[in-house]
């Protein structure tokens, strides 16, 4: 045998090459037939109708056919004869890659709730081989489950992922990535989840500022609630009592003037929307107020205390159950 | 003006040997391929052989397969066929034709 | 055996048009070429690549080729068009098949 042909892989409309090597020869007919075994060339001559067909190279060792703007159909068995006595024939086979022509993404629902399993799919169209589908949720690589539909060997791919979503999923691409010999780089789509959660209550005293709460002072506390959507209401209650008469609210701020002993309590921010509500306790202790000493009459003696307050604010903003937030004065 | 005259053509025994000559003119021989076609009396057309420019390589119907010979002589611008374990179902009028892209441009007058 | 399959006959009255078909498997692939054969003579070509025509042949023959058949048209035919013809392709992997031929008489 000294007829000689190479296997070739090409991607649906690009242009494949399909050589007829002759070793020892002086001259002689070679013949390439389609996989119909209608001939397409016959030494330099072209009696197939498609002008996808054309000559590279005709000589005594070579006959080199370039066929352009592949299709799918045109995959098969291509054989090269050589009318020697034997005659010898040998084949060629080409493949052709088809690329996913869609990628389309699909999820269940436009907006989910924090804790809600939700279901996305991603459908890889018509390729041929099956696109492999590869999910990520930002730059965490996910597991997902594909299923493969054959149609006239031409492979839909759809993968299905379950992704049960938290508040910080709220922003963050969920990507359906294809790898597939046809295609170079990177092809992906991608959606942005949207993901609601109850608000997460957050006091902050913004007076006094070194947070030691005495009788005749002032005390600002400012209430921040974030959520999704955005808290509708913010409100502030006293546990277990009534508002003093000389509080002021204004929207998350609650002001108390001239603070006396009969403040002291549990100030709850309560904040809600759609999805849940929540809050956040501040415990008032109010002090006396700082004594004065008089001066001495005879010696003159400075001292100094240092009173140390140690802020401790606990939070914990889960449905349904209390959180609190304490200052203690030590 | 393309010439195509074929000669050699006769009477002969089954089982006899001819051979055919075929004569061109008016164009440049050896850059075409050659063909043999045959047509039995009150017959249709039926290709024979077919040889390349060079001479190198040559085709034959199934139906002359061993038995008949193509070959070419460039410098005197001939073809040549060669028939051999002549039968009665081989006569007919042997036509040589000049090929151009796979079709018979010019044909010769023939010889029976 | 590869075949080409030609009507044995075709009548035609002068100037009217005379068709004569060719039918072979997957003939719309390939190109056809066309052979005219006046009694005593030999055969001329009046078209190849289904519908050329080479120098000399006059603008009344013309070709068509699709699907599984190749017709040659003769439109105003004349006395001298009365001839034998003979349709030629590549069939499947077989070279230079001809068709069993037409005679087209002229009334």
């Known amino acids: 045998q000294n007829l000689f042909t190479k296997d070739v892989t090409v991607i649906e409309g690009e242009v494949a090459t399909i050589s007829c090597q002759v070793n020892k020869s002086d001259d002689s007919v070679i013949q390439l037939l389609n996989p119909n075994r209608q001939t397409i060339y016959f030494r330099d001559f072209r009696p197939l109708k498609d002008s996808r067909f054309q000559l590279l190279n005709f000589s005594s060792s070579e006959l080199k056919v370039s066929l352009t703007n592949v299709s799918i159909s045109d995959e098969g068995r291509y054989f090269c004869q050589l009318y020697t006595d034997p005659p010898q024939e040998s084949y060629t086979t080409i493949t052709v890659l088809v690329p996913p022509r869609n990628l389309m993404i699909d999820i269940q629902k436009d907006t989910a709730v924090e804790g809600e399993e939700i279901e996305v799919n991603c459908t890889a169209m018509a390729s041929k081989p099956a696109t492999t589908i590869r999910w990520f949720k930002g730059n965490t690589e996910l597991k997902g489950k594909s299923e493969v539909e054959e149609w006239s060997d031409m492979y839909t791919v759809t993968s299905q992922l379950m992704l049960k979503v938290h508040k910080e999923d709220d922003g963050v691409p969920v990507i359906c990535q294809v790898e597939h010999p046809a295609v170079t780089g990177n092809l992906q789509t991608q959606r942005y989840l949207e993901v609601q959660y109850k608000p997460q209550v957050h006091i902050q005293m913004t007076y006094p500022l070194q947070g030691l709460t005495r009788e005749g002072d002032a005390l600002e506390l400012t209430c921040e609630a974030i959520g999704k959507p955005q808290p509708v209401m913010v409100t502030w209650v006293r546990v277990d009592d009534e508002m003093p008469q000389h509080a002021v609210l204004s929207g998350p701020n609650l002001f108390i003037n001239n603070l006396n002993k009969t403040d002291n309590g549990t100030y709850r921010c309560e904040a809600s929307n759609i999805v849940g509500k929540a809050h956040s306790d501040y415990m008032l202790y109010v002090y006396d107020p700082p004594t004065t000493i008089p001066p001495p009459t005879t010696t003159t003696t400075t001292t100094t205390t240092t009173t140390t307050t140690i802020l401790t604010i606990i939070t914990d903003s889960r449905a349904g159950e209390e959180g609190s937030i304490r200052a203690v004065d030590h | 003006e393309v010439q195509l005259l074929e000669s050699g053509g006769g009477l002969v025994q089954p089982g006899g040997s001819l051979r055919l000559s075929c004569a061109a003119s008016g164009f440049t021989f050896s850059k075409y391929e050659m063909v043999w076609v045959r047509q039995a009396p009150g017959k249709g057309l039926e290709w024979v052989s077919y040889?390349?420019?060079?001479?190198?390589?040559?085709l034959y119907a199934d139906s002359v397969k061993g038995r008949f010979t193509i070959s070419r002589d460039n410098s005197k611008n001939t073809l040549y066929l060669q028939m051999n374990s002549l039968r009665a179902e081989d006569t007919a009028v042997y036509y040589c034709?000049?090929?151009?892209?796979?079709?018979?441009?010019?044909w010769g007058q023939g010889t029976l | 055996q590869y075949e080409l399959t030609q009507p044995p006959s075709v009548s035609v009255s002068p100037g009217q048009t005379a068709r004569i078909t060719c039918s072979g498997d997957r003939l719309g692939e390939t190109y056809v070429s066309w052979y005219q054969q006046k009694p005593g003579q030999s055969p001329v070509l009046v078209i190849f690549e289904d519908n050329k025509r080479p120098s000399g042949i006059p603008e009344r023959f013309s070709g068509s080729n699709s699907g599984n058949t190749a017709t040659l048209t003769v439109s105003g035919t004349r006395a001298m068009d009365e001839a034998d013809y003979y349709c030629q392709a590549w069939v499947g992997s077989t070279p230079f098949v001809f068709g069993t031929g037409t005679k087209v008489t002229v009334l």
């Open positions: 034709a000049r090929v151009k892209a796979g079709v018979f441009d010019y």
């Open positions: 040889i390349v420019p060079s001479g190198g390589a040559t």
